[in-house]
Amino acid sequence: AYRPSETLCGGELVDTLQFVCGDRGFYFSRPASRVSRRSRGIVEECCFRSCDLALLETYCATPAKSERDVSTPPTVLPDNFPRYPVGKFFQYDTWKQSTQRLRR
């Protein structure tokens, strides 16, 4: 369980997302098919509202293999859909602090 008041902002949010999503990369807003990119993004949800690891997972660019329904092909996103590649921001020490807080 996580504390309802837990938030992640700034570089800490970027670093934590980087670890959670790994080489899948991530979006700062979920794909438009699920939620409006403009109306609700991860900054609003995780920084100003509250955040947990499950919510962070929903912003990863591609579903984790273990989570995919084998009967359904993975969502194909447009080539130009913004995505953050692994290694651009991440530093392990910051992720460690952040995920430990989210897991409490």
């Epitope: 993004g41 100003f48 910051t94 602090q97």
Partner: antibody, heavy 126, light 107 residues
């Protein structure tokens, strides 16, 4: 021209109220998180409050929680700071600052302040 | 909250000197650090962001380095326009916090 211009400062007695305004121009105000940062005379910089780009979601430093309210009117490109129950220690120059920066795809990736107003002086004294 | 500590508080230097200012964070902030310059009666001006990225229009004599908890701002050859107060700021997590400032004055 890209700029921020604060107004509304002045002399107020302890316990009094003031409302600061910050008029933005030269950029798409509604797409940026905005903040207030203050500086007491002869002292360093202190972050006071931030507000999400669309408004509604806010952050405050502990010393002003319950007394200050940050808000914005995106239709007027204006940021506000309502300051109530003012104390002597609130005396400072108040700057508005533009924060959260976007990459070429329009996604937020950074939170530094690249644009500051000139500041407005708030003096709390009897 | 993350505490930011700058050293020295005051630095006396001459035009042409190489100047280094240190900023330490009370916990790791990765590279989420900015440096600002402020002159008396003026608003702060962004110099460096993400610890080492030079803001557009800022002279190349300014540079930043470091990650984790220790950061430095270096002015390779001090110019008359550089006498000012310099602040570091972390934006790793709220509340955003600043160092107490380093005043660079004429020796």
């Amino acid at each position: 021209e890209v700029q921020l211009l604060e107004s509304g400062g002045g002399l107020v007695q302890p316990g009094g109220s003031l409302r600061l305004s910050c008029a933005a121009s030269g950029f798409t105000f509604s797409e940026y998180e905005m903040s207030w940062v203050r500086q007491a005379p002869g002292k360093g910089l202190e972050w006071v409050s931030s507000i999400y780009s669309s408004g509604g979601w806010t952050k405050y430093t502990d010393s002003v929680k319950g007394r200050f309210t940050i808000s914005r009117d995106n239709s007027k490109n204006t940021l506000y700071l309502q300051m109530n129950s003012l104390r002597a220690e609130d005396t400072a120059v108040y700057y508005c600052a533009k924060g959260v920066h976007y990459d070429s795809s329009g996604l937020p990736i950074d939170w530094y302040f690249d644009l500051w107003g000139r500041g407005t002086l708030v003096t709390v004294s009897s | 909250d993350i505490q930011m500590t700058q050293s020295p508080s005051t630095l006396s230097a001459s035009v042409g000197d190489r100047v280094t200012i240190t900023c330490r964070a009370s916990q790791s902030i990765s590279s989420w650090l900015a440096w600002y310059q402020q002159k008396p009666g003026k608003a702060p001006k962004l110099l460096i962001y993400k610890a080492s990225s030079l803001e557009s229009g800022v002279p190349s004599r300014f540079s930043g380095s470091g990650s984790g908890t220790e950061f430095t701002l270096t002015i390779s050859s001090l110019q008359p326009d550089d006498f000012a107060t310099y602040y570091c700021q972390q934006y790793n997590s709220y509340p955003w916090t600043f160092g107490q400032g380093t005043k660079v004055e004429i020796k």
